[in-house]
Amino acid sequence: VSITKCNSDMNGYCLHGQCIYLVDMSQNYCRCEVGYTGVRCEHFYL
């Protein structure tokens, strides 16, 4: 899978994680930090 960094306009899209662009799927994706989940890594779980 080819990935690259998200466009600058997506800065802040992922609240607790890194935004990556999945080129082959044409999708922005939030790779969440440990302890976080949700489309935008907005939910904390224990």
């Epitope: 466009n7 306009d9 802040g12 044409s26 999708q27 922005n28 489309v39």
Partner: antibody, heavy 116, light 106 residues
Framework: QDQLVQSGAEVKKPGASVKVSCKAS????????IQWVRQAPGQGLEWMGR????????KYREKFEGRVTITADTSTNTAYMELSSLRSEDTAVYYC?????????WGQGTLVTVSS | DIQMTQSPSSLSASVGDRVTITCKAS??????IAWYQQKPGQAPRLLIQ???TLQPGVPSRFSGSGSGTDYTFTISSLQPEDIATYYC????????FGGGTKVEIK
């Protein structure tokens, strides 16, 4: 099926304000950004600004700063664009556009006519 | 704001011709450019995103290329149904549309 349904056509007097709504279904606007784009009759497409409904953060095109306000009500899954001090040049079709995980998905457009 | 200079503003070509439209950004947009087709009275239709990624259902005669500040949109063999106005859109930093290219049949 994802949808963005915009409010109906409006006719306004110069100097008045207009508020256009954009109701989302099939997805949560908190997972997206909502952009607003307009197109005057016979003219090109013009980006106006956008909102992050989760953080309630906005970005506006410089020429609209102070005259446009973009808001979102996450309880009703609806975004709004209000434009004040209307003039004849604001006569246009206004579109809301979803962006975020996937690329842009457009509403059907709302015609705003400014006429005395 | 990033400026997008699209050219030509209009063109006339014959059915079967190769048609090329260019967009030049005022700064590097890192391949974050999309191309839209718009027919009179209709909302814009997304054809291509991320420079060259064709949307599902879009004919393969449409293609895009480029990098840095210079981008190209090509219709390899113009068809009567391609008569429309085409817009580029940079979405790297905020958003800016090009001025549009009206494509007509000769």
């Amino acid at each position: 099926q994802d949808q963005l349904v915009q409010s109906g056509a409006e006719v306004k007097k110069p100097g008045a304000s207009v508020k256009v709504s954009c109701k989302a279904s099939g997805f949560n606007i908190k997972d997206t950004y909502i952009q607003w784009v307009r197109q005057a009759p016979g003219q090109g497409l013009e980006w106006m600004g956008r909102i992050d409904p989760l953080r309630h953060q906005t970005k506006y095109r410089e020429k609209f700063e102070g005259r446009v306000t973009i808001t979102a009500d996450t309880s009703t899954n609806t975004a709004y664009m209000e434009l004040s001090s209307l003039r004849s040049e604001d006569t246009a079709v206004y579109y809301c556009v979803r962006s975020g995980r996937e690329f842009d998905f457009w509403g059907q457009g709302t015609l705003v006519t400014v006429s005395s | 704001d990033i400026q997008m200079t699209q050219s030509p503003s209009s063109l006339s070509a014959s059915v079967g011709d190769r048609v090329t439209i260019t967009c030049k950004a005022s700064q590097d947009i890192h391949k974050y450019i999309a191309w839209y087709q718009q027919k009179p009275g209709q909302a814009p239709r997304l054809l291509i995103q991320y420079t060259s990624t064709l949307q599902p259902g879009v004919p393969s005669r449409f293609s895009g290329s480029g990098s840095g500040t210079d981008y190209t949109f090509t219709i390899s063999s113009l068809q009567p149904e391609d008569i429309a106005t085409y817009y580029c859109l940079q979405y790297d930093n905020r958003r800016t549309f090009g001025g549009g290219t009206k494509v007509e049949i000769k």
